[in-house]
């Protein structure tokens, strides 16, 4: 789970060790603040749960790619 260290900065201290199906993911955000110990991805699931993930892992990169493409494709 992400931790808010103050009103403006959310950090991840641990990453999920389970791959999450892309169908369960709604969105993501990048954590890049130097106030945090590591850069991270926070995925938001379709049930609004937030999960910290390691941006170095291929499944995380693939999921970000999928979500970015999905976001830009107009839904018909």
């Amino acid at each position: 789970q992400p931790d808010a260290i103050n009103a403006a900065v959310t950090c991840c201290y641990n990453f999920t060790n389970r791959k999450i199906s892309v169908q369960r993911l709604a969105s993501y955000r990048r954590i890049t603040s130097s106030k945090c110990p590591k850069e991270a991805v926070i995925f938001k699931t379709i049930v609004a749960k937030e999960i910290c993930a390691d941006p170095k892992q291929k499944w995380v990169q693939d999921s970000m790619d999928h979500l970015d493409k999905q976001t830009q494709t107009p839904k018909t």
Epitope: T32, D68, Q72
Partner: antibody, heavy 117, light 107 residues
Framework: QVQLVQSGAEVKKPGSSVKVSCKAS????????MHWVRQAPGQGLEWMGR????????KFDPKFQGRVTITADTSTSTAYMELSSLRSEDTAVYYC??????????WGQGTTVTVSS | DIQMTQSPSSLSASVGDRVTITCKAF??????RAWYQQKPGKAPKLLIH???SLEHGVPSRFSGSGSGTDYTLTISSLQPEDFATYYC?????????FGGGTKVEIK
């Protein structure tokens, strides 16, 4: 706070090699990627490559493949970039930068490398 | 490589002006672009990354927009400290590439 401190300016002869260092403080380099970007005098920015210090996995612009070596020492939080077979067109400011997503949140101060006979 | 074409290469503006810099990618980069500011003799400074993420400490007069292949950096009211060179960069796929830069000069 995060700081990247690079080694000093170098003057090199054509055909020789140069090795530039970048020491990080305020972060654990194994948690990020360390990149190298160069800028020729009066020109734009050019990404050369990056290393994942955690597993030493590297990725390069094909333009530099075979001529550039990027290494990292996690025990000293230092990344290195070595460029071989130098030519006059390699005269540039070389920057190290940090970022796992492919953009660069923190930069070193730059190292000027002059290639001249 | 994904080529990034930035325009204009230079512009003259006055304090208080609204300034717009554009960047065109040669293929879709899905909002994976960053904008940097560079002053003479200094390293670039990250301003914006992704769709709208303003870096911590960057004034709100800077904003980014766009999608697909076309992106814009806007400075809503130019300040004296904004005179510099600005670069766009795509981080959709390696090798990561930069635009040629836009030099913002005092009119």
């Amino acid at each position: 706070q995060v700081q990247l401190v690079q080694s000093g300016a170098e003057v090199k002869k054509p055909g020789s090699s140069v090795k530039v260092s970048c020491k990080a403080s305020g972060l654990t380099i194994s948690h990020t990627y360390m990149h190298w970007v160069r800028q020729a005098p009066g020109q734009g920015l050019e990404w050369m490559g990056r290393i994942d210090p955690e597993n030493h996995n590297t990725k390069f612009d094909p333009k530099f493949q075979g001529r550039v070596t990027i290494t990292a020492d996690t025990s000293t939080s230092t990344a290195y970039m070595e460029l071989s077979s130098l030519r006059s067109e390699d005269t540039a400011v070389y920057y190290c930068a940090r970022g796992v997503f492919g953009f660069f949140e923190h930069w070193g101060q730059g190292t000027t490398v002059t290639v001249s006979s | 490589d994904i080529q990034m074409t930035q325009s204009p290469s230079s512009l003259s503006a006055s304090v208080g002006d609204r300034v717009t810099i554009t960047c065109k990618a040669f293929e879709d980069i899905y909002n994976r672009r960053a904008w940097y500011q560079q002053k003479p003799g200094k390293a670039p400074k990250l301003l914006i990354h992704g769709a709208t993420s303003l870096e911590h400490g960057v004034p709100s007069r800077f904003s980014g927009s766009g999608s697909g292949t076309d992106y814009t950096l806007t400075i809503s009211s130019l300040q004296p400290e904004d005179f510099a060179t600005y670069y766009c960069q795509q981080f959709w796929s390696a090798p990561y590439t930069f635009g040629g830069g836009t030099k913002v000069e005092i009119k």
